[in-house]
Interface confidence: medium
């Protein structure tokens, strides 16, 4: 078959057109999908007649044309082109095989920015380590919740790495989970080991009921022990009713004889009789991720005399269905400030949240948000994304609820919404955030930090920068320099000191002329590339009496690299016994290419030096 020539679809630094051509072949249906794949998805690959004549862009291809590409073809594409393909597959809702997903993920080397545009199930194959930091991981795992985790068998390495990363992201320490944690884990909750089942039975057992596939041995034993123990949510087996048995559906196989013998025999008989008539109980419902409000909760009328006239302590004695039936959502919204003072259980708070969700499906108004109090802990990042929080008072009130705990995904999302709403990270906001989370500033990406106005830098304390990396300090330093520019020498140094990890060489040279006596801890945080050009005299002036500390750090960067660049004679003038400088009679040639490869300067011995000197002399005479 003669193939027409094709120009590369994307410019790719010296790469031949072959990859693009192959891509056209598979994307236009020249490569047929396997029968099983086409059969499984109900989609069929397009025929190949004459489709290569005018190469279209990927987004114009039909699902049939996009289906069934083999991995070999993808490996020839640029990362950008792979991303384009992934987005098109998502837009067209093309069902992909595990192999295709794994292959695409492998080619998306950089962590993708636009997670929402990618096929949901593709995320299962991305490395969660690429999404570190509360905001990045929250976005990633919020999407994973919606993906079909069961595409991956339980033993698959991709699946095994997701759970620990998700637990770390959601801030779960130990084995105690809240209902919100379980909801946030989505299908990954089915992988939680037995110790979680033992310690968090109340919130986890109802989730395990709907897990597809059998629980492992460890989970089964823990579930059996929890059910036999008779704790919530199901209570002792001796008190179970037919509806309890219904609710337990998927866990029935793990019960074991001791438990079955404890269930009232009349209940077992009635349940067996009903389930033989209605076998639908065998299909565990998959919609357990949201708090479930059973039919009777929603439909039951409020008993007479129980209609709530106001939100008060009497409501703690209401059963869940009574709260649902007797508390008016509008009343709740107007009296939200009272909820926090009343010791509702988590289960009751779920009902109240459900009522607010029904009243405000597009997101709560700020008047309600400000008074959420502990109910804020029941909110998911998805809920919070619907909010428009503009008042600093609201932000403070909600941060107060989470005080003393690590930044949760809810808090990360709340802050993100608040800052985006304001358009920049102003001083008051930064003040508030760093008061609650000293490491907040360093959790932002360099791009996000670029929106911090210089005036806000006054709110930053040295400890707020402890965990910042050089890329973040590169962004913050120029802002700090601008903010503190009108201060005199010593005051300026005190303020700028914690930002110096982003300072260029010329600023360090200028500081060395001002007798600042920089301590060694600050010096060790300076950019290596900024320190290297400093002379011995400049470093001596910069450090003042602290220069003696160089000896203790001579093996560590940036001191080690700086020593390698200095003449040994000059180093000896410090009298510290620093070794490793350039010996006398050697000439340093800054061969940047060589240096970039080796990381050390190029040295020429005495022979070549004489030659160079002779050449210099000859050229001067000439």
């Amino acid at each position: 078959m003669a193939l027409p020539t094709a120009r590369p679809l994307l410019g790719s630094c010296g790469t031949p057109a072959l990859g693009s051509l192959l891509f056209l072949l598979f994307s236009l249906g020249w490569v047929q999908p396997s029968r099983t794949l086409a059969g499984e998805t109900g989609q069929e690959a397009a025929p190949l007649d004459g489709v290569l004549a005018n190469p279209p862009n990927i987004s114009s291809l039909s699902p049939r044309q996009l289906l069934g590409f083999p991995c070999a073809e993808v490996s020839g594409l640029s990362t950008e082109r792979v991303r384009e393909l992934a987005v098109a597959l998502a837009q067209k809702n093309v069902k992909l095989s595990t192999e295709q997903l794994r292959c695409l993920a492998h080619r998306l080397s950089e962590p993708p920015e636009d997670l929402d545009a990618l096929p949901l199930d593709l995320l299962l194959f991305l490395n969660p380590d690429a999404f570190s930091g509360p905001q990045a991981c929250t976005r990633f795992f919020s999407r994973i919740t919606k993906a079909n985790v069961d595409l991956l068998p339980r033993g698959a390495p991709e699946r095994q790495r997701l759970l620990p990363a998700a637990l770390a992201c959601w801030g779960v320490r130990g084995s105690l989970l809240s209902e919100a944690d379980v909801r946030a884990l989505g299908g990954l909750a089915c992988d939680l080991p037995g110790r979680f089942v033992a310690e968090s039975a109340e919130v986890l057992l109802p989730r395990l009921v709907s897990c597809p596939g059998p629980l492992d041995q460890d989970q089964q034993e823990a579930a059996r022990a929890a059910l036999q123990g008779g704790g919530p949510p199901y209570g002792p087996p001796s008190t179970w009713s037919v509806s309890t048995m219904d609710a337990l559906r998927g866990l029935l196989p793990v019960l074991g004889q001791p438990i079955i013998r404890s269930i009232p025999q009349g209940i077992v008989a009635a349940w067996r009789q009903r389930s033989s008539r209605d076998p639908s109980w065998r299909q565990p419902e998959r919609t357990i991720l949201r708090p479930r409000f059973r039919r009777e909760v929603e439909k039951t009328a409020c008993p007479s005399g129980k209609k709530a006239r106001e939100i008060d302590e009497s409501l703690i004695f209401y059963k869940k269905w009574e709260l649902e039936a007797c508390v008016d959502a509008a009343l709740l919204a107007t009296q939200m400030d009272r909820v926090n003072a009343i010791p509702f259980t988590y289960e009751q708070l779920d009902v109240l949240k459900h009522k607010l969700d029904e009243l405000y499906p597009q997101g709560y108004p700020e008047s309600v948000i400000q008074h959420l109090g502990y109910l804020f802990l029941k909110m998911s990042p998805e809920d919070i994304r619907k909010w428009n929080v503009t008042s600093l008072e609201t932000l403070k009130a909600l941060l107060e609820v989470n005080k003393g705990h690590e930044m949760s995904p809810q808090v990360a999302t709340l802050i993100d919404r608040f800052v985006k709403g304001r358009g920049q990270l102003d001083k008051d906001t930064l003040d508030t955030l760093t008061a609650f989370y000293p490491g907040y500033l360093c959790s932002l990406s360099p791009e996000e930090l670029s929106s911090v106005p210089p005036s806000s830098i006054w709110a930053v304390r040295p400890q707020d920068l402890d965990t910042c990396d050089p890329r973040q300090l590169d962004v913050l330093y120029p802002k700090a320099r601008l903010a503190f520019q009108n201060m005199n020498g010593s005051e300026y140094f005190v303020k700028i000191q914690s930002f110096l990890g982003g300072a260029p060489t010329e600023d360090l040279k200028a500081l060395s002329q001002q007798n600042v006596s920089m301590d060694l801890a600050t010096f060790m945080k300076l950019r290596t590339d900024a320190v290297l050009p400093l002379t011995v005299a400049e470093v001596q002036k910069l450090l003042g009496p602290h220069v003696e500390g160089l000896k203790a750090e001579e093996r560590h960067r940036p001191v080690r690299d700086w020593i390698l660049r200095q003449r040994q004679d000059d180093l000896d003038t410090l009298g510290l016994g620093l070794q490793g400088g350039i010996p006398n009679g050697y000439l340093v040639l800054d061969l940047s290419m060589q240096e970039a490869l080796s990381g050390t300067p190029c040295l020429l011995g005495p022979g070549p030096v004489l030659t160079v000197l002779a050449l210099l002399l000859a050229s001067t005479l000439a």
Epitope: S178, T345, E347
Partner: nanobody, 115 residues
């Protein structure tokens, strides 16, 4: 590890009394609301009485005047004194803690039977 252990349940004639105890470990009562719940066969669990960290108490209407909830912070124990017991008080009684409203921790329960 946060744990609650109930004791004091048993069988009693109508009109009799029982005193339930619940001892907590793994946290202190200083910032906790404690409560007694009960669950009769085939029924949903219901709150009977609760005591706030500031000492204020609340009771469900059906036990007001008959039951008293109290706590001994030094012993990390909460009590439920039940007088004038009725057959409808028969249930499994659970102690519960709302610790900083962040988690609800339950005990294993103690059975009260009134004949």
């Amino acid at each position: 590890e946060v744990q609650l252990v109930e004791s004091g349940g048993g069988s009693v004639q109508a009109g009799g009394s029982l005193r339930l105890s619940c001892t907590a470990s793994g946290f202190t009562f200083d910032d906790s609301d404690m409560g007694w719940y009960r669950q009769a066969p085939g029924n949903e669990r219901e709150l009977v009485a609760t005591i706030r960290s500031d000492g204020s108490t609340y009771y469900v209407d059906s036990v007001k005047g008959r039951f008293t909830i109290s706590q001994d912070n030094a012993k990390n124990t909460v009590y439920l004194q039940m007088n004038s017991l009725k057959p409808e008080d028969t249930a499994m009684y659970y102690c519960a803690s709302l610790w900083l409203r962040r988690l609800v921790c339950w005990g294993q329960g103690t059975l009260v039977t009134v004949s």
